[in-house]
């Protein structure tokens, strides 16, 4: 009785909810609902009904598979969606689909925190901000992945010589995607020691770059 | 039966603007969508949009935005079309048609269809 | 936007034979494609929806077939009244819109 799949996916996409099992054979009714009380369509003796609801229009009900097509899917399609089988015998089968809607994550932006220079070893805090998401986070020194246990937001590390990097790439994801942002120093770890400055490559409309305080006198820094 | 009758012809001078109704019979006008379809003298369909007549939500195709109104009046169980600032490619047969079945994909009931004459 | 081609654009028959015709897409458009028959100053009929299935009233000598990019309309013998031009469609997502193919002439040879 209870079947629940869960489903995640992109908002912006077409859907379609389906069971992994055939219908019941010369099943009598088919109705899907949107929560437990919300009808969204209605399959009876070879017709269709789809009734008023914020999915009227953008909905289209396969009766041999019992799928629902839905289209362009947000994120306020969240729910749990139920389709309820009437057999000939009179009995009723039930399946569930969680549907759960995901934004694409935004690209980040990485925040110098702050950088020291402790004897040779680098000290180093930086940031990844995106706006209010649940996400994962995993940072790259020169591409090459940082441990798990610093897989956070905020990158924290004292890093010595041998394993100095230029760049930092955090990488943050969800589900259904995933994007990074980018900062480089230059040189490494000499940034407040030196008046070179640090420059994100979304500042730099994507591209990744060493940058020093003269380039900066002619590039508008946010 | 289901009966989808329009108005009659209407000849107009390009600039003008044009109605054409459409009187729905024989189903719950409100559970259905209602569309409309255009086609000039000798070429093939073209679907101008839909209006949800329970709701009065619209939707209409790119070409046509800014330039139709789609209406209804449930009282009446009818559906009216305006297209403004005519021109003369817009003379054409316009048909209204109701959906198969709600869903907004296909259309299983027309109008006979409503003749519009634009000339100066 | 999603084109639908219609092939032939005129297809010249005898009564009692089989016709066949196209309808391609240019990306998928799944199951979701239609069947219209329009004859000389008459509004349109539907013949087939959702790639396969007849409408109500439709003889069974109309069939639907295809998904994904193409789909076929086949008659499977000719009546007199037949003939007349057919045109496909599909429904696209966002902005929600409907289209229609070009047509295909079905004519008596």
């Known amino acids: 009785q209870g079947h629940l799949v869960h489903m995640t996916v992109v908002s912006g996409s077409n859907v379609t909810l389906n069971i992994s099992e055939s219908l019941p054979e010369n099943y009598k009714q088919l109705t899907w609902f949107y929560t437990f009380d919300q009808k969204i369509v209605e399959w009876d003796s070879r017709k269709s009904k789809y009734f008023e609801s914020k999915f009227k229009g953008r909905v289209r009900l396969d009766p041999q598979s019992g799928a629902l097509y839905i289209s362009k899917v947000q994120k306020e399609d969240n729910s749990t969606y139920i389709m309820r089988v009437l057999k000939k015998t009179g009995n009723e089968q039930e399946w569930k689909i969680k549907l759960q809607v995901l934004d694409p994550v935004p690209k980040p932006v990485i925040k110098i925190e702050k950088i020291e220079d402790m004897d040779d070893n680098c000290y180093l805090k930086l940031s990844c901000v995106i706006p209010g998401e649940s996400v994962n986070y995993t940072w790259y020194g020169d591409k090459r992945p940082f441990p798990k246990e610093l897989q956070n937001s905020v990158l924290e590390t004292t890093l010595m010589p041998h394993n100095y990097s230029r760049c930092y790439t955090c990488q943050v994801s969800n589900s259904v995607s995933s994007k990074n942002g980018t900062v480089c120093l230059s040189p490494p770890c000499t940034l407040a020691r030196s008046e070179q400055k640090l420059i994100s490559e979304e500042d730099l409309g994507g591209e990744q770059k060493l940058i020093s305080e003269e380039d900066l006198h002619h590039h508008h820094h946010h | 039966q289901v009966q989808l009758v329009q108005s009659g012809a209407e000849a107009r001078e390009p600039g003008a603007s044009v109605r054409v109704s459409c009187k729905a019979s024989g189903y719950t006008f409100t559970d259905y969508f209602i569309h409309w379809v255009r086609q000039a003298p000798g070429q093939g369909l073209e679907w101008m949009g839909w209006i949800n007549p329970n709701s009065g939500a619209t939707n209409f195709a790119q070409k046509f935005q800014g330039r139709v109104t789609m209406t209804r009046d449930t009282s009446l169980i009818t559906a009216y079309m305006d297209l403004s600032r005519l021109k003369s490619d817009d003379a054409a047969v316009f048909y209204c048609?109701?959906?198969?079945?709600?869903?907004?994909?296909?259309?299983?009931?027309w109008g006979q269809g409503t003749l519009v004459t634009v000339s100066s | 936007e999603i084109v639908l081609t219609q092939s032939p654009a005129t297809l010249s028959l005898s009564p009692g034979e089989r016709a066949t015709l196209s309808c391609r897409a240019s990306?998928?458009?799944?199951?979701?494609l239609a069947w219209y028959q329009q004859k000389p100053g008459q509004a349109p009929r539907l013949l087939i929806y959702?790639?396969?299935n007849r409408a109500t009233g439709i003889p069974a000598r109309f069939s639907g077939s295809g998904s994904g990019t193409d789909f076929t309309l086949t008659i499977s013998r000719l009546e007199p009244e037949d003939f007349a031009v057919y045109y496909c469609q599909q429904r696209s997502d966002w902005p929600p819109s409907i289209t229609f193919g070009q047509g295909t002439r079905l004519e008596i040879k």
């Open positions: 048609a109701r959906d198969v079945d709600g869903s907004g994909w296909y259309l299983d009931f």
């Open positions: 959702d790639a396969s």
């Open positions: 990306q998928s458009v799944s199951i979701y």
